[in-house]
Interface confidence: medium
């Protein structure tokens, strides 16, 4: 239990969120951060790894509602699988319908979110910002 | 200290952020949060304060980063005063130089916040979205 | 890269009649097809699409109700549409098309000839 | 579904008019919004997708605007081989959809 060096009372009416690593946006218990460097879909993909999340995945439009509001494009967790025409998060599982639209800008295999739950298709060798989330437990 | 009853544990390794209102947004220690109705200035500012939160204000660009990539317009506590021609937030604190740019879009007294760190001045009496924030202490 | 299509005809009302769509010149397990119909003088209407390659993923409009299905055939590189209880209403030009690239499914840049089908007794 | 209304349904012009179809969502359907040309007897030719962006070999007389559930395809020279039928449809979401058509004919 050494890691766990820090009491926090919380009062009843408001509450902590997190834990998310240092200076990241927490929202309904998930962690985000923007970043500002362009890099392409695997070296966004990479950096997000490194530092113990993923590139953003979309799951819920009432529990990640923040992400209506952002502005410009950014890649998140998204890729096509040609053998099976599917759009797949980087864990695996199924984009849900009705959660993104998505939007056959340009010809690729990766996507970039822009606001209001839109879903931009990007060839992944692409330089780009990148948003990374981490879902605390 | 009866309103005190959770004690959390945090890893040295990330951190908890707040507290905040329930499913406000925390990003450094800041709490946010967007709202979608459209009221005017006063009416805006009242719901904030309902909520024990002021109507945003922006301080810093390095600590309020996030704000860079709002999208939209949504009013902020920035308001004109007209007797001595400067801007002030509604603590009565001066705008800093250099934080904001101010866009003389519509004649107003008041301002919206737009991505990048823009403020469009605006009549106060216009219906618009809203940005409350709560500084934790 | 072309679409060829096969299968029209006249047919009776309450009849049955398979189109189909051979795809050459590009990978057919990895792109979406896309069938479209356009009675004389009228719009186009979307049907429906099936995916070419492993898995098969269709989608239908609503108002088709399991009265058209999709099916391919990898090896043969061929998307077929399997009409049936077709009604004068039916009476169309049905046209297979294909999406710009296998990671869309909605914009299609590529179109067979076309195929009359007419219901009529 | 998305309901697609395209206007006017037909429209007479001559060589070197500027001509303009407009399309309207009854939803937002963001950017994806693709444009079609159609002549007798052939199988529809993408124009523009995503709202604007030119489809390659396109001429580039042809341009799209709009966003949310307005659109606009602007023809700017009309020249004797663009008199055909437009189509507007929504790649938002399945089902997809079409608008009605507009018959560009010769005044």
């Known amino acids: 239990n050494s890691l766990f060096n820090q009491e926090v009372q919380i009062p009843l009416t408001e509450s902590y969120c997190g834990p998310c690593p240092k200076n990241w946006i927490c929202y309904k218990n998930n962690c985000y951060q923007f970043f500002d460097e362009s890099k392409n879909w695997y070296e966004s993909q990479a950096s997000c790894m490194s530092q113990n999340a993923s590139l953003l995945k979309v799951y819920s439009k009432e529990d990640q509602d923040l992400l209506k509001l952002v502005k410009s494009y950014h890649w998140m967790g998204l890729v096509h699988i040609p053998t099976n025409g599917s759009w797949q998060w980087e864990d695996g599982s199924i984009l849900s319908p009705n959660l993104l639209t998505i939007i056959e800008m340009q010809k690729g295999d990766c996507a970039l979110y822009a606001s209001s739950f839109k879903g931009y298709i990007e060839n992944c060798s692409t330089p780009n910002t990148y948003i990374c989330m981490q879902r605390t437990v | 200290n009866s309103l005190f009853n959770q004690e959390v544990q945090i890893p040295l390794t990330e951190s908890y952020c707040g507290p905040c209102p329930k499913n406000w947004i925390c990003y450094k220690n800041n709490c946010y949060q967007f709202f979608d109705e459209s009221k005017n200035w006063y009416e805006s500012q009242a719901s904030c304060m309902s909520q024990n939160a002021s109507l945003l204000k922006v301080y810093s660009k390095e600590d309020q980063d996030l704000l860079k990539l709002v999208k939209s317009y949504h009013w902020m506590g920035l308001v004109h005063i007209p007797t001595n021609g400067s801007w002030q937030w509604e603590d009565g604190s001066i705008l800093s130089p250099n934080l904001l740019t101010i866009i003389e879009m519509q004649k107003g007294d008041c301002a919206l916040y737009a991505s990048s760190f823009k403020g469009y001045i605006e009549n106060c009496s216009t219906p618009n979205t809203y940005i409350c924030m709560q500084r934790t202490v | 890269q072309q679409l060829e299509q096969s299968g029209g005809g006249l047919v009776k009302p309450g009849g049955s009649l398979e189109l189909c769509c051979i795809a050459?010149?590009?990978?057919?397990?990895?792109?979406?097809m896309t069938w479209v119909r356009q009675a004389p003088g009228k719009g186009l209407e979307w049907i429906g699409c099936?995916?070419?390659?492993?898995?098969?993923?269709?989608s239908y409009a609503s108002w088709v109700n399991g009265r058209f299905t999709l099916s391919r055939d990898i090896d043969q590189s061929t998307g077929c549409l399997q009409l049936t209880s077709l009604t004068a209403a039916d009476t169309a030009m049905y046209y297979c098309?294909?999406?710009?690239?296998?990671?869309?499914?909605?914009?299609?840049?590529?179109w067979g000839q076309g195929t009359m089908v007419t219901v009529s007794s | 579904d998305i309901q697609m209304t395209q206007s006017p349904s037909s429209l007479s012009a001559s060589v070197g008019d500027r001509v303009t179809i407009t399309c309207q969502a009854n939803?937002?359907?963001?950017?994806?919004l693709n444009w079609y040309q159609q002549k007798p007897g052939k199988a529809p030719k993408l124009l523009i997708y995503?709202?604007?962006s030119l489809q390659s070999g396109v001429p580039s007389r042809f341009s799209g605007s709009g966003s949310g559930t307005d659109f606009t395809l602007t023809i700017s020279s009309l020249q004797p081989e663009d008199f055909a039928a437009y189509y507007c449809?929504?790649?938002?979401?399945?089902?997809?959809?079409f608008g009605g058509g507009t018959k560009v004919e010769i005044k």
């Open positions: 995503a709202a604007s």
């Open positions: 939803q937002d359907i963001s950017n994806a």
């Open positions: 449809q929504q790649a938002a979401s399945f089902p997809l959809t």
């Open positions: 098309a294909r999406p710009g690239y296998r990671s869309w499914s909605k914009t299609f840049d590529l």
């Open positions: 099936i995916h070419g390659g492993g898995s098969g993923t269709t």
């Open positions: 050459s010149g590009f990978d057919f397990s990895t792109y979406w």
